[in-house]
């Protein structure tokens, strides 16, 4: 029986151009975590295998940094990064647990203000 639960940061927001840490935590189970997959809708961002290390999808390699821990750091955020992110925990013997995080990337008011008064 799967007894575990995934705790996530839930709904989070960050400024355009900034970075954010996506973090999940599996609790209430003694199952061994073999791998964590990070996905955004239908896209694979990264895989962290407990023994084999990290795989970063090439389309994200310049903007994704592994860690901290089993988490994932998204950098140079754009408004297009707004959306659902999933942490998929592969465990033994329980099977798969999935957590959801919703990220909203906001236009930076500072950046907008700076752009409006930029000296040519």
């Amino acid at each position: 029986m799967m007894t575990g639960t995934i705790e996530t940061t839930g709904n989070i927001s960050a400024e355009k151009g900034g970075s954010i840490i996506l973090q999940c935590h599996l609790s209430s189970t003694t199952a061994q975590v073999t791998q964590v997959n990070w996905e955004q809708q239908d896209q694979l961002l990264a895989i962290c295998n407990a023994d084999l290390g990290w795989h970063i999808s090439p389309s994200f390699k310049d903007r994704v940094a592994p860690g901290p821990g089993l988490g994932l750091t998204l950098q140079s955020l754009t408004v297009n990064d707004t959306g659902e992110y999933f942490c998929i925990y592969h465990t033994y013997p329980d099977g798969t647990y999935t957590g959801r995080i919703f990220l909203e990337v906001l236009e930076s008011s500072v950046a907008e203000h700076g752009a409006r008064f930029q000296i040519p």
Partner: antibody
Framework: QVQLVQSGAEVKKPGASVKVSCKAS????????MHWVRQAPGQRLEWIGG????????SYSQKFQGRATLTVDTSASTAYMELSSLRSEDTAVYYC????????????WGQGTTVTVSS | DIQMTQSPSSLSASVGDRVTITCKAS??????LAWYQQKPGKAPKLLIY???YRYTGVPSRFSGSGSGTDFTFTISSLQPEDIATYYC?????????FGGGTKLEIK
């Protein structure tokens, strides 16, 4: 340039063990995970497992768990795969292969070691 | 375990032909898929990684596409040196698995 050079062909009796070596050069062995893949005559490639030389973590296919042992001697830049309790179905070419930096595809391969199990 | 089914298992084509090989995964593997070329008596060589990225030094006639469970490998204009067996490989989850291979021959 990156090179993976494997030990020579082996002929073993059923029930025996074999240890295949893989000498890495042209890169730092601790920077890439090393995997072992085998290919029986006329068969598909089969992943045995992988070892992360940086932290010593190993991952095995369930099929080989308990029978295969992957190790790395970082000072000698050499990876090893030992397979015990050999049977005729283990007759195959065994390859060491490394995964790319921060990727899981297998970008460099050894030349292969033929292991024949026969009574 | 994730099963990888390649088709066809063998095919014969002429020099200059467009050749397409498909690989179907038994479950979603996103884009965690690579393609390899293996010539007789030699080790496999990486051609395509992450479903659609051509590996360094691989000629542009080789390409890959797909995501999820269905993947395609294409040689846009077959050359004599392309005679080999081609394998797909999923690394979405362990144990990593390979397709049964497609043996390519020249007509």
């Amino acid at each position: 340039q990156v090179q993976l050079v494997q030990s020579g062909a082996e002929v073993k009796k059923p029930g025996a063990s074999v240890k295949v070596s893989c000498k890495a050069s042209g890169y730092t062995i601790t920077e890439n995970t090393m995997h072992w893949v085998r290919q029986a005559p006329g068969q598909r490639l089969e992943w045995i497992g992988g070892i992360n030389p940086n932290q010593g973590g190993t991952s095995y296919s369930q099929k080989f768990q308990g029978r295969a042992t992957l190790t790395v001697d970082t000072s000698a830049s050499t990876a090893y795969m030992e397979l015990s309790s050999l049977r005729s179905e283990d007759t195959a070419v065994y390859y060491c292969t490394r995964s790319s930096y921060y990727r899981y595809d297998l970008d460099y391969w050894g030349q292969g070691t033929t292991v024949t199990v026969s009574s | 375990d994730i099963q990888m089914t390649q088709s066809p298992s063998s095919l014969s084509a002429s020099v200059g032909d467009r050749v397409t090989i498909t690989c179907k995964a038994s479950q979603d593997v996103k884009t965690a898929l690579a393609w390899y070329q293996q010539k007789p008596g030699k080790a496999p060589k990486l051609l395509i990684y992450s479903a659609s990225y051509r590996y360094t030094g691989v000629p542009s006639r080789f390409s890959g596409s797909g995501s999820g469970t269905d993947f395609t490998f294409t040689i846009s204009s077959l050359q004599p040196e392309d005679i080999a067996t081609y394998y797909c490989h999923q690394h979405y989850t362990t144990p990593w698995t390979f397709g049964g291979g497609t043996k390519l021959e020249i007509k």
